[in-house]
């Protein structure tokens, strides 16, 4: 059988290294060797690259080496496959070396900010040594913030006569570390160099970008004062490296600015004690270069009716995220504040919050929440400066079996009945939503019986027991992950009824 006709011939000129062609099929059933016929020097010269030695038969590539690589040039290439049965020739293909030239990557030697120029980095590099001197090179600069996985790209060209191998990358974030990598190619070529070694640079620091501001309203105290826990953080989009030296807070009752009070703090939380009226609160952060824009919050009057617009809310888990979605009757509301914190028996140690805009869902990576912990999640609608009634739900990112079973006791023991009572498992030991309880009971040397009840039941009356009989009993609490038995208790039914 004749060899297959060589097809899909693809050639690439590795500048000053070799000119290599590959083709298909890559493997033949029988031993096949190949010849690559070439004309070069604009047709003036011809030669052949052959794989016909025993070690390289069946090898679907061949390389021409210097000094027979001329540039610029047009090459004609034809591949011949030969086996014991005969020869098959490819179609003749034509290659302009400028269009298939691949050069070494450039080397970035500095990525620096330029004094006094904001949000810009100047990249300086060394043009590859192995690149045609007179050629215009095209470049792709890839860049990303140091903690991002997503690259952005910018393309540009440089004439050889420039000899100014620099590029000013603008419209970056202030005071942010960027990773840069660069590749290049002759302007006419379809083949890019590899990417250069990555280099890191940091844009100049500026005054703080801004703050996100929120509050927790606490019940009024006996003396009528209202504790309001203010909290703030760098606004979404603020530079990762940004550090504030401190924060200025000022607040006053609505329409009464002459009662303005001010506070300076270096913390990101502060408790205010306000009267029952409506208050306005303002916070700015500052560093050595200036102040951030003002973050504003309206604290409603104690007796103010808040609007309600969230009708329903669902929390669901994807492979690596917790997704909370809600439905609203108010299309004009497009900002929401999401709060989440662990549902524990004591004061929550961590309280988190985040603003959501132009969406009715919120997602968080599962690994940002602790498994086996129940989280309270509340969503507040925000319409301009008004905050509406929250809607709350609970969620686990991963359920487990309870760490302990219910503590159980037997009450009202009768001749044939007993009332079993058990305590709720402490929140810290539930490890999931308790979906039901199962009571296992067994007479001495007898068969075991069980009864399953809903999670809202903490007491159950067992009937049809045998008089004057010892029983052992335990209650199992179950989550979606499985159940855990509580302590085993023993009781004995009475021999006669005691009124």
């Amino acid at each position: 059988v004749l060899p297959a006709k060589p097809e899909n011939i693809s050639c690439i000129f590795y500048y000053e290294e070799n000119f290599t062609c590959t083709w298909s099929p890559e493997k033949e059933a029988s031993y096949t060797w190949y010849k690559v016929k070439r004309t070069y020097s604009y047709g003036y010269k011809s030669d052949i690259c052959s794989t016909d030695n025993s070690t390289r038969g069946n090898h679907a590539s061949c390389s021409f080496l210097p000094p027979t690589i001329t540039n610029p040039d047009n090459y004609t290439i034809q591949v011949e496959a030969q086996n014991a049965d005969g020869i098959m020739k490819s179609d003749i293909t034509y290659w302009n070396l400028d269009a298939i030239m691949k050069i070494e990557p450039p080397e970035i030697f500095s990525v620096k900010s330029v004094l006094g120029i904001k949000r810009m980095l100047q990249i300086k590099w060394i043009r590859p040594v192995l690149a045609p001197h007179s050629s215009t090179l095209k470049y792709t600069l890839r860049f990303r913030t140091i903690n991002s996985a997503y690259w952005m790209e910018v393309n540009f060209t440089k004439e050889d006569i420039d000899r100014d191998e620099t590029y000013n990358l603008t419209e970056l974030q202030a005071f942010t570390e960027y990773v840069m990598t660069l590749r290049c190619a002759p302007a006419e070529s379809m083949f890019w160099s590899g990417w250069s070694q990555e280099k890191v640079g940091t844009t100049e620091e500026e005054a703080p970008y801004g703050l996100d501001l929120w509050r927790v309203l606490k019940p009024a105290m006996v003396d009528g004062r209202r504790p309001v826990q203010l909290m703030w953080k760098k606004a979404t989009g603020a530079p990762v490296l940004e550090k504030a030296l401190g924060y200025n807070i000022w607040y006053f009752p609505e329409n009464n600015t002459n009662l303005t009070e001010t506070v300076n703090t270096t913390n990101q939380t502060h408790e205010l004690y306000l009267g029952g009226k409506t208050y306005w609160v303002y916070v700015v952060s500052y560093n050595s270069l200036g102040e951030s824009p003002v973050a504003t919050l309206r604290i409603p009057a104690l007796n103010e009716k808040t609007f309600q617009c969230i009708e329903a809310m669902q929390a669901c888990l994807t492979q690596d995220q917790l997704v909370v979605e809600w439905q609203s009757s108010a299309p004009e509301v497009d900002t929401w504040m999401v709060e989440w914190f662990p549902d524990v028996d004591s004061e929550p140690s961590s309280f988190s919050w985040e603003s959501v805009s132009q969406a009715r869902n919120w997602t968080i990576q599962k690994d940002e929440l602790k498994p086996l912990w129940c989280y309270n999640i509340s969503v507040y609608p925000v319409l301009r400066d008004r905050v509406g009634q929250p809607y709350s739900t609970q969620a686990y990112v991963q359920e487990g079996i309870p760490s302990a079973g219910p503590v159980t006791q037997a009450d009202s023991i009768g001749v044939k009945t007993v009332t079993i009572t058990w305590k709720e498992i402490p929140k810290s030991k539930r490890n999931g939503f308790i979906k039901n309880y199962t009571i296992f009971y067994q007479a001495e040397d007898g068969k075991e019986f069980s009864k399953t009840v809903n999670s809202n039941i903490l007491q159950y009356r067992l009937e049809s027991l045998t008089r004057r009989t010892s029983y052992s009993l335990q209650v199992m609490a179950s989550t979606n992950a499985g159940g855990t038995n509580g302590t085993k208790i023993n009781f004995k039914t009475l021999s006669i009824s005691v009124l």
Epitope: K35, K37, T39, S41, G43, Y44, K45, S46, D47, I48, C49, S50, T51, D52, N53, T55, R56, C62, S63, F64, L65, P67, T68, T76, Q78, I92
Partner: antibody, heavy 131, light 108 residues
Framework: EVQLVESGGDLVKPGGSLRLSCVAS????????MSWVRQAPGKGLQWVSG????????GYADAVKGRFTISRDNARNTVYLQMNSLRAEDTAVYYC????????????????????????WGQGTLVTVSS | EVVMIQTPLSLSVSPGEPASISCRAS???????LVWYLQKPGQSPQLLIY???SRATGVSDRFSGSGSGTDFTLRISRVEAEDVGVYYC?????????FGQGTKVEIK
Amino acid sequence: EVQLVESGGDLVKPGGSLRLSCVASGFTFDDYGMSWVRQAPGKGLQWVSGINWAGGTIGYADAVKGRFTISRDNARNTVYLQMNSLRAEDTAVYYCARESPLRLGDLGGDYFYYYYYIDVWGQGTLVTVSS
Amino acid sequence: EVVMIQTPLSLSVSPGEPASISCRASQSVSSRYLVWYLQKPGQSPQLLIYGTSSRATGVSDRFSGSGSGTDFTLRISRVEAEDVGVYYCQQYDNSPRTFGQGTKVEIK
């Protein structure tokens, strides 16, 4: 047996035209380059023109540039030399020659390399340009 | 064009004696593209040496070639009667291809 047979040589007046043909046999014609080389009476060899295996013109001697044209017809195993505006100094025996890929001593590396050289010559055809 | 100068233009050698022909190029030529031919009296030329030093099929090992750049040499270790004729060098490296003017070898 490899053979090159030239024809078309003749006596022609200055300014006239002539077409030389060279029919090849005994080898796969389209794998080879072909050249015309001439030799004026009692003089040395002069390369006139050549055509590569792919059908591309190798070039022309300065003395014939613009007047002579080389071509090949692979289906007929024939190479042609069209000669126009002939001059007395074009009088010569015109040889058809085959350019074959010959392997140079191993250059190292993974592959073998072959370069094309004139290795077979025809017997020649005489062109006389005279009034 | 590249001018190829051969020396001597003629050479008379006794049988069994060595002979040497020089070929000098007006500019550098790749050794891959330097060839020697012999044209025996009344015959077409035949290929002797290609790529400066590789012998063509059937050529006696009495013939050897060497050189690089602009200076190339053809040597015959022991001249025999069948070696008479005109020897030509030719370069393929630059267009147009050019021959030397020829060196006539005869037997004393």
